[in-house]
């Protein structure tokens, strides 16, 4: 129950108070007493309950016609059962009684009141009155957890601004209104009473920037909606008529958690008294409701796919035209970011990875947009983010960046457990340097920081420095699978192409040629690849540095050694001896369900099938999936990526809710 | 086989800042690394940065780390040295270098750290 | 004081061999393949004459060559001939902070 504030009683004059039901109020009984008096009795309005203690040991006694020592160890509370019809309409009596002289009463006139901020602390969806039953104050994870949730209101419904909603400080219509949080203050008072006591809705100064609540007008159009709390304005007084009343006001956050901002938002309403002009308002009663911003969360590739995006670019027909029969076959919706919009820039994945938030009325897909800020710069926050899509970017807008922080180089897991700590919504991939030098690359700090501050997918930094573009989407890719724990790990695997390819030169097709078909290109049998020695040297490298992962991902994401599958792929080192795929890099796939978008190989063709693509299908049809092979290799392999690096997938949110998890 | 070009050179005081341009013609860039060397007058040679082909990583001198930014735009087939800060020490001829076309063998060991192309250099004077 | 050592100067007559040392150390010459050879001709830019310790672009005679043992590297010229006084610079990769490491250069004079 939520504390009121201490009144002291006087016999020399009545005390007027007020409580508000839900309240708990501590009465001094004794510091006023009369000096000969050693114990007293209490009557009290059929409104009131009193409770007297005596500790310690504390015994509770509700008032009765008992009389009581008069000693500090005495506790008297009171609460109030029914708001007051008038002023003062609810008395208490206290009667002191001391040997020698006759009984002394002091009178207390109690107005009770009901004040209480409500917003959904029980994650229903609904605001219903807590009465303050619950301790709104706190904010708890878990299943049985409780706290209320703000949405970073981070789309733009307003098709003609080019801002975001949480940017301005209007309410633009019923839309913009349903991003936000609903809070009720409800008020039952005598009539008069707010002649004499005053209401503020108030946040603290160091959450200010990061919230803004908007007053609804009952029963008229959101577009009466005005700003009553933001960054401009901490506190706020607030008109409130005497009786019965509910005020509606809608919470907008303007700031995802990140290191300096841990989500938490209070907000909290005072019941000030201002009956004496003489002196300052003294505060009577606060209540607060404690919102935590709704992270941005990141899908795995074994959620469902709903939208698939690419760039046409110089002749790419051919690779869009298999990506959108892909996707149709997955059943998503497909969007072409045209040539004159891309600028020539076709790495889709790598400027923009799309996650979600959700708060229990609204779900809402967010595009966080890397810093890169290439040729697409502009197309996340021109083209992606609108009406019910959200926004958000992080990290130096111009320069300080490194190819770490494009966002081939993000990823998360599928659901996972990890030696009994449970990861319901994945853990977040990002690569890095083994050990920082002056040259070594890493992800911004700026992007790190926002990435562990969400706190529901917590990173694993992986070592990507070894390849030339330096992206974890260069060595490894989740697939869905019907069993174990319901996806595979597909790890680039240059010791997997070795065998195969020794396997079949012992079969006899050493003379068989790598990147055949393809103009232009050197062709390579098999038996010179595996002669190479320099090749071989540099695959063992590669071989090591992968395998490093592989043992930090087993340990991250408590996998077992079924739970990997081996891509045959070879790599090269190049400028500065960073690795690059010396084929198509196979595990650079666009995942859609069970429709898998590969880059075609090119490897040798034995028994009129390439060898490559059979192995991959062997390794990944018995799990329900359907391998397509894409011909990236001109306008995506040559330039150091592949499918996935070119193409861009928003997922159905989890149907897990991340307030329900324990981080 | 490419060619290089560099510009931008010329007479800046201690503290100021120039950028150098370093164009290709006859074959595209985006193929090759870049790398910056100078000489200074009547001296050695110095390797400055480097960029490579893919775009996606550079490295720097200690010299002149955190004074120095080298970055590339494909579509002006033309790399930058975006020079802060400078000291009399920078005073040098700069050349921009690149790789010669990739030998297409099934692997080209020990790329980024030799320069087959060099232009013709540009004189950078810092004095007051 | 450049971070790899050459001998400031050398010189032999026409038809000798000269063999330039370029002196490192185990963080650099000593551990990579990767030392090139660059001659200078006064006024004009420097040419690539050798890369990955022995191997020559094409268009370098076979006269110059180039070998490694332990932490030194050395280039030699046979069959010398006038054009090929010049300046030579040898290169290293290196594990120090800054990857790319010169010789202070060794002029060759053809007497």
């Known amino acids: 129950m939520a504390q009121g504030t201490l009144i002291r009683v006087t016999p020399e004059q009545p005390t007027h108070a007020v409580c508000v039901l839900g309240t708990l109020t501590q009465l001094d009984i004794c510091s006023s007493a009369p000096e000969d008096c050693t114990s007293f009795s209490i009557n009290a309005s059929p409104g009131v309950v009193v409770d007297i203690a005596h500790g310690p040991p504390a015994k509770k006694k509700s008032t009765g016609s008992s009389t009581w020592p008069l000693d500090p160890g005495v506790e008297v509370t009171l609460t109030m059962k029914v708001a007051s019809g008038s002023t003062g309409d609810q008395k208490v009596q206290i009667s002191y009684y001391g040997p020698k002289t006759p009984p002394v009463k002091a009178l207390l006139y109690l107005t009770g009141v009901e004040i209480s901020l409500c917003a959904d602390i029980t994650r229903t969806g609904k605001v219903k009155p807590t009465r303050a039953v619950k301790d709104q104050r706190t904010w708890t994870w878990g299943p049985c957890g409780q706290g209320a949730i703000l949405l970073v209101n981070c789309d733009r419904d307003n098709l003609e601004s080019s801002a975001m909603d949480c940017e301005d400080d209007e309410v633009l219509d019923s839309e913009d209104l349903q991003d936000m949080s609903l809070m009720t203050l409800s008020t039952k008072t005598p009539k008069d009473f707010f002649t004499n006591h005053t209401l503020v809705l108030h946040v603290a100064r160091s959450e200010m920037d990061k919230v803004r609540v908007f007053q609804a007008t009952r029963g008229k159009l959101s577009s009466k909606c005005s700003v009553v709390l933001g960054p401009k304005w901490p506190s706020h007084y607030l008109m409130v008529p005497g009786g019965k009343h509910n005020m509606d006001f809608y919470v907008e956050a303007l700031a995802f958690p990140d290191t300096d901002f841990p989500g938490l938002i209070t907000l909290t309403i005072s019941l000030l008294d201002t009956s004496n002009l003489e002196l300052p308002e003294a505060v009577v009663f606060q209540d607060s409701v404690v919102f935590r911003v709704a992270p941005w969360i990141m899908t795995p590739n074994t959620q469902p796919p709903q939208e698939v995006y690419a760039c046409s670019i110089f002749e790419n027909e051919d690779f869009l035209k298999s990506v959108t029969t892909l996707a149709m076959k997955a059943k998503c919706k497909l969007t072409i970011c045209p040539e004159e919009e891309n600028m020539d820039d076709q790495w889709m994945q790598d400027e923009m990875e799309i996650g979600y938030i959700q708060a229990p009325h609204k779900t809402l897909p967010v595009v966080f947009d890397s810093p890169r800020n290439r040729g697409l710069k502009e197309f996340p926050i021109k083209r992606v983010m609108g009406p019910d899509f959200g926004y958000v970017t992080r990290g130096p807008q111009t320069g300080g960046i490194s190819g770490l922080d494009s966002f081939g180089n993000l990823e998360v897991s599928p659901p996972v457990t990890v030696r009994g700590k449970e990861y319901p919504l994945g853990r977040i991939l990002f690569g890095d340097s083994c050990y920082p030098s002056n040259d070594s690359r890493q992800m911004h700090q700026a992007l790190q920081d926002f990435l562990s501050a969400q706190q529901v997918q917590a990173p694993v930094k992986l070592y990507s420095d070894w390849l030339s573009v330096g992206h974890v989407d260069e060595f490894l890719s989740f697939v869905p699978a019907p069993d174990r724990k319901g996806f595979r790990l597909l790890l680039a695997s240059p010791r997997s192409c070795y065998k195969l390819f020794q396997e079949q030169q012992n079969e006899g097709h050493g003379e068989a040629l790598l990147f055949e078909g393809i103009k232009k290109k050197k062709q390579q049998k098999i038996k010179n690849i595996l002669s190479n020695k320099t090749l071989r040297e540099h695959n063992s490298f590669v071989e090591r540095c992968i395998d490093w992962n592989r043992e930090l991902l087993k340990r991250e994401l408590g996998l077992a050694e079924s739970d990997i599958i081996d891509i045959p792929q070879l790599f090269k080192l190049k400028e500065f001896s960073k690795a690059e795929a010396f084929f198509p890099n196979m595990v650079n796939m666009l995942v859609l369900g069970k429709h898998l978008g590969i880059p075609k190989p090119f490897g040798p063709v034995i028994n009129g099938r390439c060898c490559l693509e059979e192995k991959v299908c062997s390794l990944l049809e018995p799990l329900g999936l359907q391998c397509t092979f894409i011909n990236d290799f001109f306008t995506y392999h040559i330039r150091h990526g592949e499918v996935h690096c070119g193409t861009n997938v928003r997922r159905k949110p989890f149907s897990f809710k991340w307030w329900n998890m324990v981080p | 086989q490419v060619q290089l070009v560099e510009s931008g050179g010329g007479l800046v005081k201690p503290g100021g800042s120039l950028r150098l341009s370093c164009a290709a013609s006859?074959?595209?860039?985006?193929?090759?690394?870049v790398s910056w060397i100078r000489q200074a007058p009547g001296k050695g040679l110095e390797w400055v940065s480097f960029?490579?082909?893919?775009?996606?990583?550079?490295y720097y001198a200690d010299s002149v780390r955190g004074r120095f930014t080298i970055s590339r735009d494909n579509a002006k087939n033309t790399v930058y040295l975006q020079m802060n800060s400078l000291r009399a020490e920078d005073t040098a001829v700069y050349y921009c270098?690149?790789?010669?076309?990739?030998?297409?063998?099934?692997?080209?060991?020990?790329?980024?750290?030799?320069?087959?192309?060099w232009g013709r250099g540009t004189l950078v004077t810092v004095s007051s | 004081q450049s971070a790899l050592t050459q001998p400031r100067s050398v010189s032999g007559s026409p038809g000798q061999s000269v063999t330039i040392s370029c002196t490192g150390t185990?963080?650099?010459?000593?551990?990579?393949?990767?030392v090139s050879w660059y001659q200078q001709h006064p006024g004009k830019a420097p040419k690539l004459i050798i890369y990955?310790?022995?191997e020559r672009p094409s268009g370098v005679p076979d006269r110059f060559s180039g070998s490694k043992s332990g932490n030194t590297a050395s280039l030699t010229i046979s069959g010398l001939q006038a054009e090929d006084e010049a300046d030579y610079y040898c290169?290293?990769?290196?594990?120090?902070?800054?990857?790319?490491?010169f010789g202070g250069g060794t002029k060759l004079t053809v007497l």
């Open positions: 990955n310790v022995y």
């Open positions: 006859g074959s595209t860039l985006s193929d090759y690394f």
């Open positions: 270098t690149s790789d010669a076309p990739e030998v297409d063998d099934i692997v080209a060991p020990g790329r980024g750290y030799y320069m087959d192309v």
């Open positions: 960029v490579n082909s893919a775009n996606t990583f550079t």
């Open positions: 185990r963080g650099d010459v000593g551990r990579y393949n990767h």
């Open positions: 290169s290293s990769h290196s594990r120090s902070s800054t990857p790319v490491l």
